[in-house]
């Protein structure tokens, strides 16, 4: 129904805490350097506003749109060109081109430096004076470097962040509560930032109809009892809360999520028997819940699924009555059936479908022309399930630490081009996938990889869209995403690619290495491994391993030595003449 | 919604012809392959012919081979069917189908062969 005033509609649904976290991080992702005190004073003025609204409707300016008033606000801010540049020129447009403009001029890669968690003390200290300035700190730093981030998911992290910190806070020894706990909560929230930027990448480049096809399987091999109705209620909500998020629409997409778990916990029975324990939460840890819910117990007396797709001589015939209909329903027969499956590999072979329909249905015998199409999706399937093996063998072999190495060689192999920090960057993550996924029951380690990898490639291909450097990345990141992680697994060493000269102040080391984190000194070789495959391209695993090993022994070395300034400064030119020599 | 419209029936003595036509809306008709099924009385459904897309390539059942002549016309989006030398044993109702699909989903016309 239509409000007389959507400022005052949200705020009364969201409750003031909520609104005022949302607002936040809808500021904090538009302008990703102002500071945390300037978005403060602005999210006060709009919740004090929002305020008179709820009070009164009819009031000044009431009417305006969210996006007015928002838009407003951040074009109101001093020096916004100095800081911002020609994101001020949006300010001279009107709605819903200049939210569309705010839109484009997020930076999905902003150059803020890395967020430092402080030590314990400090860290209780501040977050017992004000707990709700401490929280809005951490909302804004988590939002101004991922622009993209799910607020509502976000507002939970946050609700996890703050329970962490009450316990932990309250401990003797502060430290060894907080560092794992916390840890956990950032790697999740982590891996929740490049998921949901997949969904928007999904959402921008594909339209709705590729999201709602990505919710339609997800949701099938989440709730195979429900039927295709009830998918399709769901997909087409989850839809418009993505869509609604993705456009930094974020006061109702967390009021639409609101309104969707609200809507599974009352059709519990037409949705899934797995429901209750999410349902009996708050309601932040229950929509985060929903959202991961395991899958329901499969039907056991599921028809093949050839009998209403091959074999009844009416495929055509409804093909043609309702082509998305159709598909749609053979995406949910599909998935409901195969929780096994990463949503990617159903959607490709959902397209293969509709490709062999496309092409069967206009022949003179269509039945003897996809008659065999499920066999056709062999192939299809193999691959990822080879991927799977091939990688998990690898990281059981290697740890986490070898296998992010193995994926550093064959992606500078593969795109020799690309920036070492972004390089470094996407084996680190790609390599997680092992921790992540392989130690998982067979049968869901292949949606967990191949998921997982998608997620972290697209986050490969908007840094690489920046600056393009590589040809071959161009053309895995141009085609379908569900396309983007065969073509990246396919692609081998770029014979176009002119060796890097050997600088030998790449490859020299200084003693301050010796005292950072483990995290920073993996960093620093796995930077110097990248260099060296940029400068041989078809060295050997051998080579790279004898150069990897004797500069990890050249740092255990120094770094116990009484002087290592000297050590160092001596043994480091040893070093780069060996590996020059390793090499050649 | 998917419609077809079969038209071009009636009475006819053995051994003379008809042109069936079938004026089809509703999905993209140059997309699909087309059919002419019948349905004698008393009889289950049997296939006659069938049409690709293009148009390029039939198929006939051996009853109906060097007789029958299926065509389309995809600027018109209807499918047609020349039949010659009619025999008694043709009588039946006439329906046509997308894709090699064997059910009614219109109306039909009615070709009687009788003296």
């Known amino acids: 129904e239509a409000h007389k005033s959507e400022i005052a509609h949200r705020y009364n649904d969201l409750g003031e805490q909520h609104f005022k976290g949302l607002v936040l991080i809808a500021f904090s992702q538009y302008l990703q350097k102002c500071s945390y005190d300037e978005h403060a004073k602005l999210v006060q003025e709009v919740t004090d506003f929002a305020k008179t609204c709820v009070a009164d409707e009819s009031a000044a300016n009431c009417d305006k749109s969210l996006h007015t008033l928002f838009g407003d606000k951040l074009c109101a801010i001093p020096n916004l060109r100095e800081n911002y540049g020609e994101l001020a020129d949006c300010c001279t447009k009107q709605e819903p081109e200049r939210n569309e403009c705010f839109l484009q001029h997020k930076d999905d890669n902003p150059s803020l430096p890395p967020f430092e968690r402080p030590e314990a003390e400090a860290m209780c200290t501040s977050f017992k004076e004000n707990p709700t300035t401490f929280m809005g700190h951490y909302l804004h730093e988590v939002a101004r470097r991922h622009p993209y981030f799910y607020a509502p998911e976000l507002l939970y992290y946050a609700e996890q962040y703050n329970e962490i910190l009450t316990q932990c806070c309250a401990e003797a020894d502060k430290e060894s509560c907080l560092t794992p706990k916390l840890d956990g909560v950032k790697e999740k929230a982590l891996v929740s930032s490049v998921r949901q930027r997949m969904k928007c990448s999904s959402m921008q480049k594909f339209g709705e109809r590729a999201f709602k096809a990505w919710a339609v399987a997800r949701l099938s091999q989440t709730f195979p009892n429900a039927d295709f109705a009830e998918i399709t209620k769901l997909a087409t909500d989850l839809t418009k809360v993505n869509k609604e998020c993705c456009h930094g629409d974020l006061l109702e997409c967390a009021d639409d999520r609101a309104e969707l778990a609200k809507y599974m916990c009352e059709n519990q029975a037409t949705i899934s028997s797995k429901l209750q324990t999410c349902c009996d939460k708050p309601l932040l840890k229950k929509a985060h819940c929903l959202s991961e819910v395991e899958h329901d117990t499969m039907p056991a007396d599921l028809p093949a699924i050839a009998a209403d797709f091959v074999e009844d001589q009416e495929v055509c015939k409804n093909y043609a009555e309702a082509k998305d209909v159709f598909l749609g329903t053979f995406l949910y027969e599909y998935s409901r059936r195969h929780p096994d499956y990463s949503v990617s590999l159903l959607l490709r072979l959902a397209k293969k479908y509709e490709a062999t329909l496309e092409k069967c249905c206009a022949e003179a015998n269509p039945p003897a022309c996809y008659g065999t199409v499920l066999a056709e999706f062999q192939p299809l399937v193999e691959e990822p399930k080879n991927l799977v093996k091939t990688n998990c063998d690898l990281y059981e072999k290697l740890g986490e630490y070898g296998f992010q190495n193995a994926i550093l060689v064959r992606y500078t192999q593969k795109a020799p081009q690309v920036s070492t920090p972004t390089l470094v960057e996407a084996a680190r993550n790609l390599g997680r996938v092992g921790t992540k996924c392989c130690t998982l029951p067979e049968d869901q380690r292949l949606p967990c990889v191949e998921d997982y990898l998608s997620a972290i490639l697209n986050r490969v291909c908007l840094l690489h869209e920046k600056t393009p450097v590589s040809e071959h990345v161009t053309k895995c990141c141009s085609g379908s995403l569900v396309e983007r992680r065969p073509c990246f697994s396919a692609l081998t060493v770029d014979e176009t690619y002119v060796p890097k000269e050997f600088k030998a102040e790449t490859f020299t080391f200084h003693s301050d290495i010796c005292t950072l984190p483990e995290k920073e000194k993996q960093i620093k070789k796995q930077t110097a491994l990248a260099e060296l495959v940029k400068h041989k391209p078809k060295a050997t695993a051998e080579q790279l391993k004898t150069v990897m090993d004797d500069f990890a022994q050249f740092l255990d070395t120094c770094c116990k030595a009484a002087d290592k300034d000297t050590c160092f400064s001596t043994e480091g030119p040893n070093l780069v003449t060996r590996c020059k020599d390793a090499l050649a | 919604k998917v419609q077809l419209l079969e038209s071009g029936g009636g009475l006819v003595q053995p051994g003379g012809s008809l042109r069936l036509s079938c004026a089809a809306s509703g999905f993209t008709f140059h997309s699909f392959g087309m059919s002419w099924v019948r349905q004698a009385p008393g009889k289950g459904l049997e296939w006659v012919s069938s049409i690709s897309g293009s148009g390029s390539d039939t198929l006939y059942a051996d009853s109906v081979k060097g007789r029958f002549t299926i065509s389309r016309d995809n600027s018109k989006n209807t499918l047609y069917l020349q039949m010659n030398s009619l025999r008694p044993e043709d009588t039946a109702v006439y329906y046509c189908?997308?894709?090699?699909?064997?059910?009614?989903s219109s109306q039909g016309t009615l070709v009687t062969v009788s003296s």
């Open positions: 189908t997308i894709g090699g699909s064997l059910s009614r």
